[in-house]
């Protein structure tokens, strides 16, 4: 049994048939020593009486908030909670493998330029009684300040019967130079709590290989004199690191037709202009990637060619 | 990624280009070796990231750009101490911290280029002859630190007397190769900068 | 989703005693309490007996305290009500449940899983 955070305590379970469980001592935080009681999760039911309380705990019913009281006083709490381990691997149920870029992947992390700012985001299926709390550090064995948000909720999708949930959390390095060489992996540890089921997530990058930029901005077309062809131009998107001349981008330009079959012409260019050919319905598409280091392509930015 | 590329222009920074062609020849050996040694953990999630040039050059510092400077945390540690003359300066007024950037790159590539061959001499006595250096890539570090023309003494090629042990070696370049990728990307950033500049 | 499938109901003389069992499959490692609730017919289905988790706390109205015990052999996954000193008001049908939910362990509301029910007729 460990301490997640004041009052709150999480009891490890090998998980099989006849599992002995864990046998847990509580003690009432009071200098008092007589005719203490106490209850869980809110029913009026004495489950015994004393300064300690001794309950085995063999599953997650064995849980909740035990509370000691004297007199109708509320004296301390105890939120006990379960991590589940089963054949030796701790339970992932609350949140979903994306299995990208490879299976067990519940966490993932983006970030759009060098400043030490991430994202991470995560999904699940749970609807109530569900809330995270995120830690992030630079390196694990002499962690370097990453300072996170609060996760929210931020956005809801509906998968078949299901209804899926992302949410995701914002992070900042204390002290991140955007020049700097990484040499320890940002490591960032989810804590999961649905009801009383306790399990930790954790992720593991260099802020180089979760790169990926905004789309290009301010895109447009100059058609030429007497010809098919238009001059495309764009500029770095504004989120990305300064100088550009320093953290420079390599773009591709693509021109796809109206119909996903039509064969797309692709253009690859270190500039920020590129001459093509336009055809009629056709859309003219750009997006970026760091010019010397191939994390992820933006996402597109596209205009008509009409 | 396999894009074409557009040469660069005759009368642009001459390190440039042997810069682009480090970095393409860096990355082209170090997805060879993790190819190669697919049952070795050499995937950038399985090894110690180690710097050979760790307290021995500052290229970062050095080469950090003007409009950086400013980031409290990109100036822990600037060193002063290089040595200020070399051919990719001399059509252009260039600053001290501009001679301590690109003489710092140069002993980078010095430091990789001695600890490459050593390893390459321990691969070619492999029974199993799995992997080698590309000689493409020892060319190319060559050839920038020609362009980059600093006079500095030559470092001895270092040599064991004792049986190589191939696993660790093997190991070693992993570690070596991604540590020279991110080095190599450092650089052509660099380049890059001055080039606008 | 946890299935549950009671037995041992029947036609007994008041005073005596029946143990009813109910089996639980599926995802049953999810669930904070199991119960046993009864519906005379016109009534409303009112609570007898819910065992927290492997029996850290057990709770019963004051209608049967000390009449009806309530156990679990979590190895089995199975849990038992014991009534003895049965009345004619004890007829009824009985049904287990089991529920997720931390609160409110006596409200029938709040469980999410229901077995089919078995009849228990108290009569001379």
């Known amino acids: 049994i460990w301490e997640l955070k004041k009052d709150v305590y999480v009891v490890e379970l090998d998980w099989y048939p006849d599992a002995p469980g864990e046998m847990v001592v509580l003690t009432c935080d009071t200098p008092e020593e007589d005719g203490i009681t106490w209850t869980l999760d809110q029913s009026s039911e004495v489950l015994g009486s004393g300064k300690t309380l001794t309950i085995q705990v063999k599953e997650f019913g064995d849980a909740g908030q035990y509370t000691c009281h004297k007199g109708g006083e509320v004296l301390s709490h105890s939120l006990l909670l379960l991590h589940k381990k089963e054949d030796g691997i701790w339970s992932t149920d609350i949140l979903k493998d994306q299995k990208e870029p490879k299976n067990k992947t519940f966490l993932r992390c983006e970030a759009k330029n060098y400043s030490g700012r991430f994202t991470c985001w995560w999904l699940t299926t749970i609807s109530t009684d569900l809330t995270f709390s995120v830690k992030s550090s630079r390196g694990s064995s002499d962690p370097q300040g990453v300072t996170c948000g609060a996760a929210t909720l931020s956005a809801e999708r509906v998968r078949g019967d299901n209804k899926e949930y992302e949410y995701s959390v914002e992070c900042q390095e204390d002290s991140a130079c955007p020049a700097a060489e990484e040499s320890l992996p940002i490591e960032v540890m989810v804590d999961a709590v649905h009801k009383l089921k306790y399990e930790n997530y954790t992720s593991s990058f260099f802020i180089r290989d979760i790169i990926k930029p905004d789309p290009p901005k301010n895109l447009q077309l100059k058609p030429l004199k007497n010809s098919r062809q238009v001059e495309v131009s764009w500029e770095y998107p504004d989120t990305w690191s300064t100088p550009h001349s320093y953290f420079s981008l390599t773009f591709c330009v693509q021109v796809q037709g109206k119909s996903k079959r039509e064969k797309k012409d692709r253009v690859f260019t270190d500039k920020t202009s590129a001459t093509v050919i336009c055809r009629k319905n056709a859309s003219i598409s750009v997006r970026a990637q760091d010019r010397y280091y191939s994390s992820s392509w933006s996402e597109w930015a596209s205009v008509p060619c009409s | 990624r396999n894009l074409p590329v557009a040469t660069p222009d005759p009368g642009m920074f001459p390190c440039l280009h042997h810069s682009q062609n480090l970095l393409r020849a860096v990355s082209n050996m170090l997805q060879k070796a993790r190819q190669t040694l697919e049952f070795y953990p050499c995937t950038s999630e399985e090894i110690d990231h180690e710097d050979i040039t760790k307290d021995k050059t500052s290229t970062v510092e050095a080469c950090l750009p003007l409009e950086l400077t400013k980031n409290e945390s990109c100036l822990n540690s600037r060193e002063t101490s290089f040595i200020t003359n070399g051919s990719c300066l001399a059509s252009r007024k260039t600053s001290f911290m501009m001679a301590l950037c690109l003489s710092s790159i140069y002993e980078d590539l010095k430091m990789y280029q001695v600890e490459f061959k050593t390893m390459n001499a321990k691969l070619l006595m492999d029974p199993k002859r799995q992997i080698f250096l590309d000689q493409n890539m020892l060319a190319v570090i060559d050839e920038l630190m020609q362009a980059l023309n600093f006079n500095s003494e030559t470092v001895p090629q270092k040599s064991s007397l004792e049986e190589p042990d191939f696993y660790k070696t093997k190991i070693k370049l992993c570690i070596l190769l991604h540590a020279f990728r991110i080095r190599a990307v450092t650089i052509d950033r660099v380049m890059s900068y001055l080039n606008a500049s | 989703e946890v299935q549950l499938v009671e037995s041992g109901g029947g036609l007994v003389q008041p005073g005596g005693s029946l143990r009813l069992s109910c089996a639980a499959s599926g995802r049953t490692f999810e669930t904070i309490a199991m119960g046993w609730f009864r519906q005379a017919p016109g009534k409303e289905r009112e609570f007898v007996a819910v065992?927290?988790?492997?029996?850290?706390?057990?709770y019963y109205p004051e209608s049967v305290k000390g009449r009806f015990t309530i156990s679990k052999d979590s190895s089995k996954n199975t849990v038992y009500l014991q009534m003895n000193s049965l009345r004619a008001e004890d007829t009824a049908v009985y049904y287990c449940?089991?529920?997720?939910?931390?609160?409110?362990?006596?409200?029938?509301?709040?469980?999410?899983?229901w077995g089919q029910g078995t009849q228990v007729t108290v009569s001379s």
């Open positions: 449940a089991a529920t997720t939910n931390r609160f409110k362990n006596t409200d029938y509301t709040t469980y999410d899983y």
């Open positions: 065992i927290r988790g492997s029996g850290v706390a057990t």
